[in-house]
Amino acid sequence: KKVVLGKKGDTVELTCTASQKKSIQFHWKNSNQIKILGNQGSFLTKGPSKLNDRADSRRSLWDQGNFPLIIKNLKIEDSDTYICEVEDQKEEVQLLVFGLTANSDTHLLQGQSLTLTLESPPGSSPSVQCRSPRGKNIQGGKTLSVSQLELQDSGTWTCTVLQNQKKVEFKIDIVVLAFQKASSIVYKKEGEQVEFSFPLAFTVEKLTGSGELWWQAERASSSKSWITFDLKNKEVSVKRVTQDPKLQMGKKLPLHLTLPQALPQYAGSGNLTLALEAKTGKLHQEVNLVVMRATQLQKNLTCEVWGPTSPKLMLSLKLENKEAKVSKREKAVWVLNPEAGMWQCLLSDSGQVLLESNIKVLPTWSTPVQP
């Protein structure tokens, strides 16, 4: 007997062909011999089966001796053997209906687990293989689990169900809720305005939740909440903000924070958390601020950086267009009795300048000028 696989919620068309290319009498019945549908002349008649309102045919095909049975909005329990009676012949078709669903929401937080559950008719023994958007294959039986979802797992998962050498394909759209970057670093000279941006890696029509930025300043013994805010339908409203520093926050997405001035006491690292409505867990993004200051006190020219710098970063002091006078993998460098001219303080990583501050050293009889 012919085997046809169907998907829950879909439509299936079972074919039945007579040898005569004309409209003749036919009937479709289920395995309990209950009539589903048939014809009376050129009109469709329906029987008392449970499929009554979901069964149909294509009358335009009857003249060619084709008498399809269409079943709409398939249910797992529609799995059965269907019999087409035409010209004193019986054609049997076994229909197996499968369903594949994500047993939680399809919008999941980064790091959470995805479980896909296969619904199948009794007596079937299907195998399932799913391919993630990044090409990772997972196999299983009735359930498939993927732990620790990553940002690259966002997108369409294609799952193939195999049964009786036949296959049916399911596509499930998964959205991994995360920030675009897990961590970011902002390098600023003392006194400059600082912009922190927290773009999301997903788009949803309505986004509601609340968030907070905790800050651990390098100079402070404990962390402190700098700002708390609410998010309602993508609109941001500040709930509470510290007096020092007085952060400003953009009213629209992406989440955007402005620190009026970069000061050494603010250098450090922060953790922005976002709790979304109806979701367990939170989204996190780490943000780091490195602040540079170049000063001249009496005969000492000093360059300092505060904040989380990697040990491989190089701090240098050099007179413009000349070789570096001093270059160290440290957070402070200085030059005694610097000669007059424009000095540059550079923070660099493998030759790439991350931060630069210029200071003008005047001849010894005058005071220094900082541009």
Partner: antibody, heavy 120, light 107 residues
Framework: EVQLVESGGGLVQPGGSLRLSCAAS????????MSWVRQAPGKRLEWVSA????????YYPDSVKGRFTISRDNAKNTLYLQMNSLRAEDTAVYYC?????????????WGQGTLVTVSS | DIQMTQSPSSLSASVGDRVTITCQAS??????IAWYQHKPGKGPKLLIH???TLQPGIPSRFSGSGSGRDYTLTISSLQPEDFATYYC?????????FGGGTKVEIK
């Protein structure tokens, strides 16, 4: 001879409503699924709604869902299309079409159409 | 929704010419394609359904072929009354969609 005659078209303001009718003759109306198809000026034909022979099922594309309602009166051999919240892009010639038989069959007979103009 | 791409959008031909119009579906439509002829001021007329089944009363110079996603309407020898616009229709699922039409004009 199968005949389908549409009526009820005309000029209507955006946001307004209109009800189209289609009088059917020459066949047993209650045995056929029916449809409305439209053609905007210079555009392709666009199917806008369908109804099964005994009104069990109705179908609409997303472009009109929630605004248009198809219905039929088998005793009067008439098909209707109630159009609400009309937009400029609904301006078109609206055709009443008979399906070959059921919901899944193509259109085999069409009326001559009635023009609906949505403009302020 | 299934998209139907019809080509050409217009063509000029002479009486007696062989004319071919194609329609490509965005996915397999299982031969559920119909072809219509449309003349100004009238309703469209069904020529062919189920890829190649000719409607009663339609001249045999009209024929249809194809499978999967690609389908063709052929007029073997164009007659004066055949100058019109032709549309394909997919009816594989309940959201019927038409091709953009092909206007057949006199050369």
């Amino acid at each position: 001879e199968v005949q389908l005659v549409e009526s009820g078209g005309g000029l209507v303001q955006p946001g307004g409503s209109l009800r189209l009718s289609c009088a059917a003759s020459g066949f047993t109306f209650s045995n056929y699924a029916m449809s409305w198809v439209r053609q905007a000026p210079g555009k392709r034909l666009e199917w806008v709604s369908a109804i099964s022979d005994h009104s069990t099922n109705t179908y609409y594309p997303d472009s009109v869902k929630g605004r248009f309602t198809i219905s039929r009166d088998n005793a009067k051999n008439t098909l209707y299309l109630q159009m609400n919240s009309l937009r400029a892009e609904d301006t078109a010639v609206y055709y009443c079409a008979r399906k070959y038989g059921g919901d899944y069959d193509p259109f085999d007979y069409w009326g001559q159409g009635t023009l609906v103009t949505v403009s302020s | 929704d299934i998209q139907m791409t019809q080509s050409p959008s217009s063509l000029s031909a002479s009486v007696g010419d062989r004319v071919t119009i194609t329609c490509q579906a965005s996915q397999d439509i299982n031969n559920y394609i119909a072809w219509y002829q449309h003349k100004p001021g009238k309703g469209p007329k069904l020529l062919i359904h189920y890829t190649s089944t000719l409607q009663p009363g339609i001249p045999s110079r009209f024929s249809g072929s194809g499978s999967g996603r690609d389908y063709t309407l052929t007029i073997s020898s164009l007659q004066p009354e055949d100058f019109a616009t032709y549309y394909c229709l997919q009816y594989d699922n309940l959201l019927f969609t038409f091709g953009g039409g092909t206007k057949v004009e006199i050369k």
